[in-house]
Each structure stands twice: as structure tokens, then as C-alpha cells.
């Protein structure tokens, strides 16, 4: 009678095993052991029992145990289980952006690992298991179906084997795959808002708004606003679910024409984009020339207005004749049009938009000076001891310097109040001098003395 | 326009000495004329001026000792006994009130009057 | 009599700084007073005339205010070529006046 001991074996691949065989008679003619394994016997006293040492076990065997007795021959086999945990658990790659709603399937794949009966792969979302399968094919392939949801932003998926040696008295081996961190997103099917002055002047700078809603999540969402070529470097806030981006947008003349103003909105995989068009114009204000800013009175004036060739003028509210870019008007200079405005309006389309520009210039009219009876008086009578505030008034622009002398060294204190006394009265030489000249008039004070009764 | 002082130099105390003011570019009829003397080291002193009237009006010290006069072209400052306290740079000037924006605009570089004996 | 007072008689100042003059009239000579500057060995140059206007080719850092009895020169971001002496003038009374002129002020600059 031949036996095996032990009889049954588990043990890790390229692991190695003591096997012992014995046989019943004293005096076997023959005992060993059957197997393609690489041995070594271990030498021990007496003749029944034989040990080997078998290694390098890479898969299932079952080596024999052999005896030859005077009673005849007979076998014991000896069963060697070999585990191994997989070589490769993984998930099968996906983008790592999902829209919200989708149907996402998992497919985790298992290469290797064995005792197949007890390896088993299981599908997680964090700790959550989706589906549990035992490992079957090479590879082994287990897959589930996710409706994506907005709850499931940034949660981490994967996959798990388990290969459960605990009944064989090893423990439960677990490999786990690289995880995929699934990025949730809504991006709603209306494009994005955008707010923009339809015409823009060469040289100014507008203010451009693109706005949507209904985005998660609203902070991953990248926003690109350009005019033509030009980039534009938005400012950008969010709300719960929504973002409003605002940019200057500067125009220069090599700007000039119609431009494609662009926002697009990119959130995942997935885009919105609004389209408008915006009209660069130039348009300068109208040029207002005087023949002369400044002119001596009962000079011929020439007030031109000249704008934008396409434009339209009014010159002091009065449209040009014919209707067009110029208009022009001609005035003798009197001392009432010193001060006076000419305002040019010219109005200009662009792009069914009425765009108006204005610039006025003042005439300057030089006259005087002038003294008159009216504004400065040649007799004044006031009593002694009174007070009394000559008044003297000059004309011209530019305004004169008004002196009021007698005997050409006692000024007379005009628009001051002054207590009347002897030394008051006399005639006083008025003079009122510009860069227009010099004219004077004589003012007499007559001083009444107080009757004494 | 111009004024021009003449006649300083030295004199003796309690002589008589009349210095000229020499103007041109405008008229005597119509501006007054005034003297105005400074000691060495000390500040301006206001003498007396002749109206374009020909009046005369004089610092309150200044009366009977000084007497201004004019012709067309000139004004003259007669000083009567002179003393050593006379010594100063006498100045003509063209009376200020009058002025477009000049006053006292006008002086004269002014003469020396020594009064020593 | 329309006497005329200065003061200081004499101000130390440094370059870049501001001076003030004041000057009063024993009464009323309305706006009618001037400011004069003398530099040794030359003859006065008219600064301010009617209180406040300002002499032509006279720079702006200059000013003249005040009217009646009271009134003031303000020299600001003084330079040295304004060392020299300053004077105040009435302009109002030619007669019964002892001076029309006030005593002076020396301004030296450091």
C-alpha cells in the first residue's frame, strides 16, 4: 500500500512543496515519485519513506507516489493547486468628461490570476459595489451600465478582484485597477447670451457681456470671447449655475468694417458658441473753422462746418443746402457776436444706427473801448458828508482798464463807497484803454455843502 | 516813453539848487509829474507832484522848501536852502494814477545831490 | 493823512520758500496802492498795481491782495535773484500826505 502525504496543496505559482511518500512493506523493491516538476530528494534513514522536494510550481499537478512490494505494486497522487493574483485589472479607458444623463458603461478587464473558482471581479463607484462576477474567460470581462448624474461629479470608479483563499485557510487576496474620476457636466442646448454695442467708433472702447445659465459645474467652464482676431480678456463671475463674462473691447482704425464678435462657452467635451456682428466706424466730429477766432469788429467772418464725407450738417440748426457734409455762413462782426457759439451737428449711419457728433466754436469780437452818458454819467451833485458809490462804467472787449483822474493824480474811488468831502469835487478825466485803444470823457462832481439855518 | 533827471551834483548848505526832468513820447497836459528822493541806505521819500493842471500838491514836510514847476518838455524841483539831510538820488517819475497798468512805471535813473560844505 | 506802514523791516527767507509782506493804511485808500522792488544801485521796478494786477513781464509768483487799509505781498517758491528791497505805494492822495511810501522791507535770501 503506497501513500501521499500531504494529499492536497495550495500554494503561490513558482512556490515549492515538501512531498513525502511511504509505502506499507518493509523491503520495497521500488519507491519514488512521478512527476514533470523539477525534485530533490531529501535523504532520511530506513527504506519505506521517501521526501522531495518539488519547486518552481507554475501551475496544477498532480505528482505520484509509487511503491513496488513483494505484494505488488501501487499509487497514491498527491493534489499541488497553484494561485496567483491577476496580472492586469483595469478599466477600460473613457473620456473623463460625461454629460449628465448619459448611459456610461464600465468594462473592467482581468488578465491571469487562478484558482479561477475563486476569483471573483466586482465594479465600484467609491466604496459602492455596482456588480459583483466571478472571473470567467482570459480575459475576464465583467461591464455595467451608469446613468450618469450631477451626484456623481468627481466620484471615482473602479474595479476590484478578490481572489478568496480564506476557505483553503490563506487569506483574500484583493487587486484594484487605476481608478476613473468621472467628471459630470451640463452644458444646456441654448446658446450663450451675448450683449454687445451693434456699432462701435474706431478709437473707443465698448464693453462686451456673454452670459449663460444652467451650466454645471459652472466654475470648469471656459469662456473665449474674441472680436475678429482679437482676444478678448473677460472678467468673469458665476453664480450657482450661471456666469457672466464682460470685456473691454478696444477698436482702432485698422479695426474699420464689419467684425465677427464670438463667444463660446466650453464645458466638457462639448460647446456653445453665439455669433454676432459688430460695425467699426470712424467717424471724427465735424471741423467748425472761423476765418478768425478773433476779429476786430465789422470784419467779414466765414463760419465753416466740414464732417465725415457720408455725413449730414447743421450749422446753428440750419441744415446744409444742399443736404450733405458742408455747410457755411457769412457775418459782418458786431460787438453782440462776441461770445457767440457756432455748433456744428453732423449725423452719420452706420449700420441702420443714427450716429450724431457735435463741435462748436466761439467767435471772439474785438471792440471799444466805449464810454457813454448811459453807463458812466458827466454830472453827479451829492450832498457833503454823504455817502455815495461813483459808478463809471467801461466797454469793450478786451475788457478796458477804466482810471478816473483829476488833475491827473486824484483818482476817483469808482464802485467804491466814499464819504463825500470837499476835496471830492472837481472834473475828472475818464479813461478807458485796450489793445483796441483809448477813449475818455470828462465827469464832473458837485459837492453841496449843508445849509446852516 | 522817458524821463531823465539833470542839475545834481554838489552844493553847498543854504544855497538854492534846481534839478530838470526831461520827458518824451508824451505830453505834460496830460499827466501829472512827480519827485521822489532817497538818502544812501535809506527808504523812498515822497517830495511833491505837479498835477497836469499845473497845480501843485506837496508832502506836508516838504512845503516851502521845495517848489515844482513845468514847461512843455521839462518839470523842475527847486530846493532852497539846502542842508546836509538833503542828500539823496532824487527821482522824476511820471504819476502812477493815470496809467494803463503803470504805475510809477515811469522813473527816472535819478540824480545825486551832495549837499556838503 | 494817508500814512503808510510796513512790516517787516527786514525777513530772512530760503530759497524755495514763501514770504509775506503786509502794509497798512492809516485809512482807506480803497484798492489804489502799489508794490515796488529795489535793488541796490537801480532804480524801483513796479511789481503790483491796484492791489492785485500784476505788472506786465512780472512772474506770477508774486501776488498782491488786500484793499482799504489792509494789504499784503506774497513772494511763493522764492528764488535768490529776489533778494532786494520792497516797498509799498498809496495812490490815492497826492496832498497832506507825509509819504505815500511805506518804510521798506529787506528781504535777504539764503
Known amino acids: 500500500q503506497t501513500s501521499v502525504s500531504p494529499s492536497k496543496v495550495i500554494l503561490p505559482r513558482g512556490g515549492s512543496v515538501l512531498v513525502t511518500c511511504s509505502t506499507s512493506c518493509d523491503q520495497p523493491k521500488l519507491l519514488g515519485i512521478e512527476t514533470p516538476l523539477p525534485k530533490k530528494e531529501l535523504l532520511l534513514p530506513g527504506n519505506n519513506r521517501k521526501v522531495y522536494e518539488l519547486s518552481n510550481v507554475q501551475e496544477d499537478s498532480q505528482p505520484m507516489c509509487y511503491s513496488n512490494c513483494p505484494d505488488g505494486q501501487s499509487t497514491a497522487k498527491t493534489f499541488l493547486t497553484v494561485y496567483w493574483t491577476p496580472e492586469r485589472v483595469e478599466l477600460a479607458p473613457l473620456p473623463s468628461w460625461q454629460p449628465v444623463g448619459k448611459n456610461l458603461t464600465l468594462r473592467c478587464q482581468v488578465e491571469g490570476g487562478a484558482p479561477r473558482a475563486n476569483l471573483t471581479v466586482v465594479l465600484l463607484r467609491g466604496e459602492k459595489e455596482l456588480k459583483r462576477e466571478p472571473a470567467v474567460g482570459e480575459p475576464a470581462e465583467v461591464t455595467t451600465t451608469v446613468l450618469v448624474r450631477r451626484d456623481h461629479h468627481g466620484a471615482n470608479f473602479s474595479c476590484r478582484t478578490e481572489l478568496d483563499l480564506r476557505p483553503q485557510g490563506l487569506e483574500l487576496f484583493e487587486n484594484t485597477s487605476a481608478p476613473y474620476q468621472l467628471q459630470t457636466f451640463v452644458l444646456p442646448a441654448t446658446p450663450p447670451q451675448l450683449v454687445s454695442p451693434r456699432v462701435l467708433e474706431v478709437d473707443t472702447q465698448g464693453t462686451v457681456v456673454c452670459s449663460l445659465d444652467g451650466l454645471f459645474p459652472v466654475s470648469e467652464a471656459q469662456v473665449h470671447l474674441a472680436l475678429g482676431d482679437q482676444r478678448l480678456n473677460p472678467t468673469v463671475t458665476y453664480g450657482n449655475d450661471s456666469f457672466s463674462a464682460k470685456a473691454s473691447v478696444s477698436v482702432t482704425a485698422e479695426d474699420e468694417g464689419t467684425q465677427r464678435l464670438t463667444c463660446a462657452v466650453i464645458l466638457g467635451n462639448q460647446s456653445q458658441e453665439t455669433l454676432q456682428t459688430v460695425t467699426i466706424y470712424s467717424f471724427p466730429a465735424p471741423n467748425v473753422i472761423l476765418t478768425k477766432p478773433e476779429v476786430s469788429e465789422g470784419t467779414e467772418v466765414t463760419v465753416k462746418c466740414e464732417a465725415h464725407p457720408r455725413a449730414k450738417v447743421t450749422l446753428n440748426g440750419v441744415p446744409a443746402q444742399p443736404l450733405g457734409p458742408r455747410a457755411q455762413l457769412l457775418l459782418k462782426a458786431t460787438p453782440e457776436d462776441n461770445g457767440r457759439s457756432f455748433s456744428c451737428s453732423a449725423t452719420l449711419e452706420v449700420a441702420g444706427q443714427l450716429i450724431h457728433k457735435n463741435q462748436t466754436r466761439e467767435l471772439r469780437v474785438l471792440y471799444g473801448p466805449r464810454l457813454d452818458e448811459r453807463d458812466c454819467p458827466g454830472n453827479w451833485t451829492w450832498p457833503e458828508n454823504s455817502q455815495q458809490t461813483p459808478m463809471c462804467q467801461a466797454w469793450g472787449n478786451p475788457l478796458p482798464e477804466l482810471k478816473c483822474l483829476k488833475d491827473g493824480t486824484f483818482p476817483l474811488p469808482i464802485g467804491e463807497s466814499v464819504t463825500v468831502t470837499r476835496d471830492l469835487e472837481g472834473t475828472y478825466l475818464c479813461r478807458a484803454r485796450s489793445t483796441q485803444g483809448e477813449v475818455t470823457r470828462k465827469v464832473t462832481v458837485n459837492v453841496l455843502s449843508p445849509r446852516y439855518e | 516813453q522817458s524821463v531823465e533827471e539833470s542839475g545834481g551834483g554838489l552844493v553847498k548848505p543854504g544855497g538854492t539848487l534846481t534839478l530838470t526832468c526831461t520827458v518824451s513820447g508824451f505830453s505834460l497836459s496830460s499827466y501829472a509829474m512827480g519827485w521822489v528822493r532817497q538818502a544812501p541806505g535809506k527808504g523812498l521819500e515822497y517830495i511833491g507832484i505837479?498835477?497836469?493842471?499845473?497845480s501843485t500838491y506837496y508832502a506836508t514836510w516838504a512845503k516851502g522848501r521845495f517848489t515844482i514847476s513845468k514847461t512843455s518838455t521839462t518839470v523842475d524841483l527847486k530846493i532852497t536852502s539846502p542842508t546836509t539831510e538833503d542828500t539823496a538820488t532824487y527821482f522824476c517819475v511820471r504819476d502812477p494814477y493815470d496809467s494803463y497798468d503803470a504805475a510809477y512805471r515811469l522813473w527816472g535813473p535819478g540824480t545825486l545831490v551832495t549837499v556838503s560844505s | 493823512a494817508y500814512d503808510m506802514s510796513q512790516t517787516p523791516a527786514s525777513v530772512e527767507v530760503a530759497v524755495g520758500g514763501t514770504v509775506t509782506i503786509k502794509c497798512q493804511a492809516s485809512q482807506s485808500i480803497y484798492s489804489y496802492l502799489s508794490w515796488y522792488q529795489q535793488k541796490p544801485g537801480q532804480r524801483p521796478k513796479l511789481l503790483i498795481y491796484?492791489?492785485?494786477k500784476l505788472a506786465s513781464g512780472v512772474p506770477s509768483r508774486f501776488t498782491g491782495s488786500g484793499s482799504g487799509t489792509e494789504f499784503t505781498l506774497t513772494i511763493s517758491g522764492v528764488q535768490s535773484d529776489d533778494a532786494a528791497t520792497y516797498y509799498c505805494q498809496q495812490a490815492y492822495s497826492s496832498s497832506n500826505v507825509d509819504n505815500v511810501f511805506g518804510g521798506g522791507t529787506e528781504v535777504v535770501v539764503k
Open positions: 505837479i498835477g497836469s493842471s499845473g
Open positions: 491796484d492791489a492785485s
